[in-house]
Interface confidence: low
């Protein structure tokens, strides 16, 4: 929801966080801002206290309950506020209907590991981390490596259209430092976008054998 | 105390438009989403469409390319509008909201206003 | 959409007796409501979220029921409880609502 030179966004993890960040222009730094989420349908409502993350923006989490628990569904509609404290009262500076399962954006796949590793190729696996059990195999994965010399910028994205979570790395250089990182998206959702990068993963491919390329 | 009166309906021509009303009075249309439910005569209640607190909709997909649910929060009225009516539209149409959270149900009815559509 | 499937369509008892009316989802839903309707009236609420009675119910009104398959049920019918009942499911949009029950006095 955009008023003015306002802007509020918000993310549904698909389990029990709404990240949002609002940022305006010209706005005091100094004032007290917070997000109020009222579900339509549920017996609960929550605030977060927003905190700046730049000149212009601030951001905040609500916790909506256990980080596994299923707090909303596709039929929800959780109006989104942001007040601002003006001396003794309260005034809004932004609101938008949010449809969780409309504005998705999982965590980051957690639990990185090598399976197995050999002079060219690499096999590695992960875990989605609080993913709703209503997505079944609807999701999708991006992988990149990040080769010697290279920036994770410039390297190549591997897309997995379907709920795989390993990978098996090919043409890989032997005896070289790799590191890996993954991210996931579910299929579902107007605006969903793309979870952060997991955490690197480092490994290092075996050395060629001697008179041997294995 | 809760009230919700609809206005607009009346006979309406094959292929006109309709606008009904439904001005809400004890509670403010920025904090509860309206919904609209219609019946054909002595027929069951049908869904139609909802206008959420800050102003979003959800439609029935059978009627989304002809219904427009609107409102003005400063009249604290909600308006439905739905063209290319054809006879099979005729019914009394209802707005309606939920209690506190929708869990509670339709709650609070219209009285309802009856939409004629015959030439 | 999820159809809703009233069974049955209409039914005539006595003053007192029970009164049993089913609702069958055509795929599993969360939240069953239970309406009123008296002829020429809007529709009253009755049972929210499953089993919860609607504020100012009589409490010979009662409902059941999970994932497909849902009950109505009024204990001790009275002749004021001449109406037709639907059911509502709250699960997915388009929301929908049972063909109705009408229920008659012997």
């Known amino acids: 929801a955009v008023n003015g030179t306002s802007r509020f966004t918000c993310f549904y993890n698909s389990r029990a966080n709404i990240s949002c960040v609002w940022s305006q222009d010209g706005a005091l730094q100094d004032t007290s801002c917070q997000v109020h989420a009222w579900p339509d349908r549920r017996r609960w409502n929550q605030t977060c206290e927003l905190l700046p993350v730049s000149q212009a923006s601030w951001a905040c989490n609500l916790i909506l309950g256990t980080p596994d628990s299923q707090k909303l569904t596709a039929v929800d509609i959780v109006t989104l506020r942001v007040m601002c404290r003006e001396g003794v009262r309260w005034r809004m500076m932004a609101i938008q209907d949010f449809k969780p399962f409309e504005n998705l954006r999982l965590m980051a796949p957690i639990s990185l590991q090598v399976v197995h590793v050999e002079t060219h190729r690499c096999n590695i696996s992960w875990k989605i981390s609080q993913a709703s059990h209503y997505f079944e195999r609807h999701l999708e994965f991006e992988a990149r490596t990040l080769s010697p010399g290279h920036t994770w910028e410039e390297a190549p994205l591997m897309t997995l259209k379907q709920k795989q979570e390993w990978i098996c790395l090919e043409t890989l250089t032997p005896d070289t430092q790799y590191e890996f990182q993954v991210r996931v998206k579910p299929l579902q959702g107007e605006f969903t976008t793309w979870s952060p990068w997991s955490q690197p993963l480092a490994f290092r491919t075996k050395p060629a054998a001697l008179g041997k390329d294995t | 105390e809760v009230q919700l009166l609809e206005s607009g309906g009346g006979l309406v021509q094959p292929g006109g438009s309709l606008r009904l009303s439904c001005a809400a009075s004890?509670?403010?249309?920025?904090?509860?989403?309206v919904h609209w439910i219609r019946q054909a005569p002595g027929k069951g209640l049908e869904w139609l469409g909802v206008?959420?607190?800050?102003?979003?909709?959800d439609y029935n997909a059978a009627f989304i390319s002809r219904l427009t649910i609107s409102k003005d929060n400063s009249k604290n009225t909600v308006y439905f509008q739905m063209n290319s009516l054809r006879a099979e539209d005729t019914a009394v149409y209802y707005c309606?909201?939920?209690?506190?959270?929708?869990?509670?149900?339709?709650?609070?009815w219209g009285q309802g206003t009856l939409v004629t559509v015959s030439s | 959409d999820i159809q809703m499937t009233q069974s049955p369509s209409s039914l005539s008892a006595s003053v007192g007796d029970r009164v049993t009316i089913t609702c069958q989802a055509s795929?599993?839903?969360?939240?069953m409501y239970w309406y009123q309707q008296r002829p020429g009236k809007a529709p009253r609420l009755l049972i929210y979220?499953?089993?919860n009675l609607a504020s100012g119910v009589p409490s010979r009104f009662s409902g059941s029921g999970s994932g497909t398959s849902y009950t109505f049920t009024i204990s001790s019918l009275q002749p004021e409880d001449i109406a037709t009942y639907y059911c509502?499911?709250?699960?997915?949009?388009?929301?929908?609502f049972g063909q109705g029950t009408k229920v008659e006095i012997k």
């Open positions: 206008i959420w607190s800050g102003g979003s909709t």
């Open positions: 979220d499953t089993s």
């Open positions: 309606a909201r939920a209690g506190d959270y929708n869990y509670d149900g339709f709650a609070y």
């Open positions: 004890g509670f403010s249309v920025t904090s509860y989403g």
């Open positions: 509502q499911q709250w699960s997915t949009y388009p929301l929908t």
């Open positions: 795929s599993s839903v969360s939240f």
